[in-house]
Interface confidence: low
């Protein structure tokens, strides 16, 4: 046997090169036949009415043909025949790779609620061989479940991803990435998750800055509520008691002027949206006011000026205990 060929792998739509090579040439006729055993070339003559076949080289030792715009129907065995005595035959197999025609990502719900499990499907249609589908949530790879369907040597792969969503997933892309021998680089499609979650409530003490609340002082608390959708209601209540009459509510802010001991208690900021409600508690303890101890008075007889030195001692009735800022989120 001195007739040689090489198998060819080509991407659909591209160019395949078929070569029939003769080691020891004796000027015998070389013929190339298609999978239906129709003659494509007989020496340098093409009887087949398919202009996609073009002669690249013809000699006694080689018949080289190009096939442009390769389609899946071109796949199969191409036969080289050498009319020696006896005749020799060798075949080359053309394998056509078909990249997925369409990459579709289908998310079960446009908007999900935190804690909910949603189904995301990605379909890579009509590829050959079957496509490998990989899933990513942001940069994290996830495991999907693939189902392959075959028709006429073409494969449609559908991968299903069951995804439990958390509030941190809001705005994060779910990426369906394709791996296929006919695809160079990254072929992917993505959908951004929209996750609704109940509010997170946080109370900030904006006055006094040093955090010590004393009788006669003012108190200002700001309630920060973050959720999706943005909380529609932010309300202040006093737990187990009425709100002081001198308390002023302004949107997310609570002002209490001229604090006194009767203001002691737990103040709750409540926020809600369509997903749920949450609250944060602030425990107010009003400390005693600063106490003043009068110092001795020094009088100088040589002048009419009296110098009074005032020694101020700030006493804390809860000295040694922890500070007064107590916020508890729920």
């Amino acid at each position: 046997q001195n007739l040689f060929t090489k198998d060819v792998t080509v991407i659909e739509g591209e160019v395949a090169t078929i070569s029939c090579q003769v080691n020891k040439s004796d000027d015998s006729v070389i013929q190339l036949l298609n999978p239906n055993r129709q003659t494509i070339y007989f020496r340098d003559f093409r009887p087949l009415k398919d202009s996609r076949f073009q002669l690249l080289n013809f000699s006694s030792s080689e018949l080289k043909v190009s096939l442009t715009n390769v389609s899946i129907s071109d796949e199969g065995r191409y036969f080289c025949q050498l009319y020696t005595d006896p005749p020799q035959e060798s075949y080359t197999t053309i394998t056509v790779l078909v990249p997925p025609r369409n990459l579709m990502i289908d998310i079960q719900k446009d908007t999900a609620v935190e804690g909910e499990e949603i189904e995301v499907n990605c379909t890579a249609m009509a590829s050959k061989p079957a496509t490998t589908i990989r899933w990513f949530k942001g940069n994290t790879e996830l495991k999907g479940k693939s189902e392959v369907e075959e028709w006429s040597d073409m494969y449609t792969v559908t991968s299903q991803l069951m995804l439990k969503v958390h509030k941190e997933d809001d705005g994060v892309p779910v990426i369906c990435q394709v791996e296929h021998p006919a695809v160079t680089g990254n072929l992917q499609t993505q959908r951004y998750l929209e996750v609704q979650y109940k509010p997170q409530v946080h109370i900030q003490m904006t006055y006094p800055l040093q955090g010590l609340t004393r009788e006669g002082d003012a108190l200002e608390l700001t309630c920060e509520a973050i959720g999706k959708p943005q909380p529609v209601m932010v309300t202040w209540v006093r737990v187990d008691d009425e709100m002081p009459q001198h308390a002023v509510l302004s949107g997310p802010n609570l002002f209490i002027n001229n604090l006194n001991k009767t203001d002691n208690g737990t103040y709750r900021c409540e926020a809600s949206n369509i997903v749920g409600k949450a609250h944060s508690d602030y425990m107010l303890y009003v400390y005693d006011p600063p106490t003043t101890i009068p110092p001795p008075t020094t009088t100088t007889t040589t002048t009419t000026t009296t110098t009074t030195t005032i020694l101020t001692i700030i006493t804390d009735s809860r000295a040694g205990e922890e500070g007064s800022i107590r916020a508890v989120d729920h």
């Epitope: 189902e147 369907e149 075959e150 028709w151």
Partner: antibody, heavy 119, light 108 residues
Framework: EVQLVESGGGLVQPGGSLRLSCAAS????????MSWVRQAPGKGLEWVSG????????YYADSVKGRFTISRDNSNNTLYLQMHSLRAEDTALYYC????????????WGQGTTVTVSR | SSELTQDPAVSVASGQTVRITCQGD??????PSWYQQKPRQAPVLVFF???NRPSGIPDRFSGSASGNTASLTIAGAQAEDDADYYC???????????FGGGTKVTVL
């Protein structure tokens, strides 16, 4: 030769049950999504139900949901349609069809089996 | 649930071109499949997707789609093309499939 042959049709009273079968041959049955499509006398085609190659996913038209159950036996190359609580409007010629790319196109059809629901 | 709308009937002289249309919201997203059904016979797939004609279907059958409308064109209709033609598509994002009401093509 690729072939689908339906059986199991017949006359049944309203509220009754019937099981249709579809025997497949000439292709790798487990690789294809399969469907049932019906045609009432003198009317158009109506998709009834579909099942994935593995049998793991099933799909139904609203008109039969809860009453009909599609299933398949890949070892015997057979598709089934179990029909309960049959109504007069279920009277039709029931076709079994092979799905191409899921159910986006049905490229092989059987000749159908007739279901008549009547007193 | 969506629906696919087809003209009930259309006539064409032999050798002339006939265009069958199919309208529906699902066609904004999906290419339809087209089926030919002759009396007392099972449907036959004649065209599907963007440009797919099953083997054995004459090349006088072609399809196109734009917006929510899809068309099947028979260029040079033959007597054997006298049949009912149905379009079919997936129903939006639901796992349901729709058929149009069918168009009866009469080749005169």
């Amino acid at each position: 030769e690729v072939q689908l042959v339906e059986s199991g049709g017949g006359l049944v009273q309203p509220g009754g049950s019937l099981r249709l079968s579809c025997a497949a041959s000439g292709f790798t049955f487990r690789s294809y999504t399969m469907s049932w499509v019906r045609q009432a006398p003198g009317k158009g085609l109506e998709w009834v139900s579909g099942i994935s190659g593995s049998g793991g996913s099933t799909y139904y038209a609203d008109s039969v949901k809860g009453r009909f159950t599609i299933s398949r036996d890949n070892s015997n190359n057979t598709l089934y349609l179990q029909m309960h609580s049959l109504r007069a409007e279920d009277t039709a010629l029931y076709y079994c069809a092979r799905g191409l790319y899921g159910l986006y196109a049905m490229d092989v059809w059987g000749q159908g089996t007739t279901v008549t629901v009547s007193r | 649930s969506s629906e696919l709308t087809q003209d009930p009937a259309v006539s064409v002289a032999s050798g002339q071109t006939v265009r069958i249309t199919c309208q529906g919201d699902s066609l904004r997203h999906y290419y339809p499949s087209w089926y030919q059904q002759k009396p007392r016979q099972a449907p036959v797939l004649v065209f599907f997707g963007e440009n797919n004609r099953p083997s054995g279907i004459p090349d006088r059958f072609s399809g196109s789609a734009s917006g929510n409308t899809a068309s099947l064109t028979i260029a040079g209709a033959q007597a054997e093309d006298d049949a009912d033609y149905y379009c079919s598509s997936r129903d939006g994002n639901d796992d349901r499939w729709l058929f149009g009401g069918g168009t009866k093509v009469t080749v005169l």
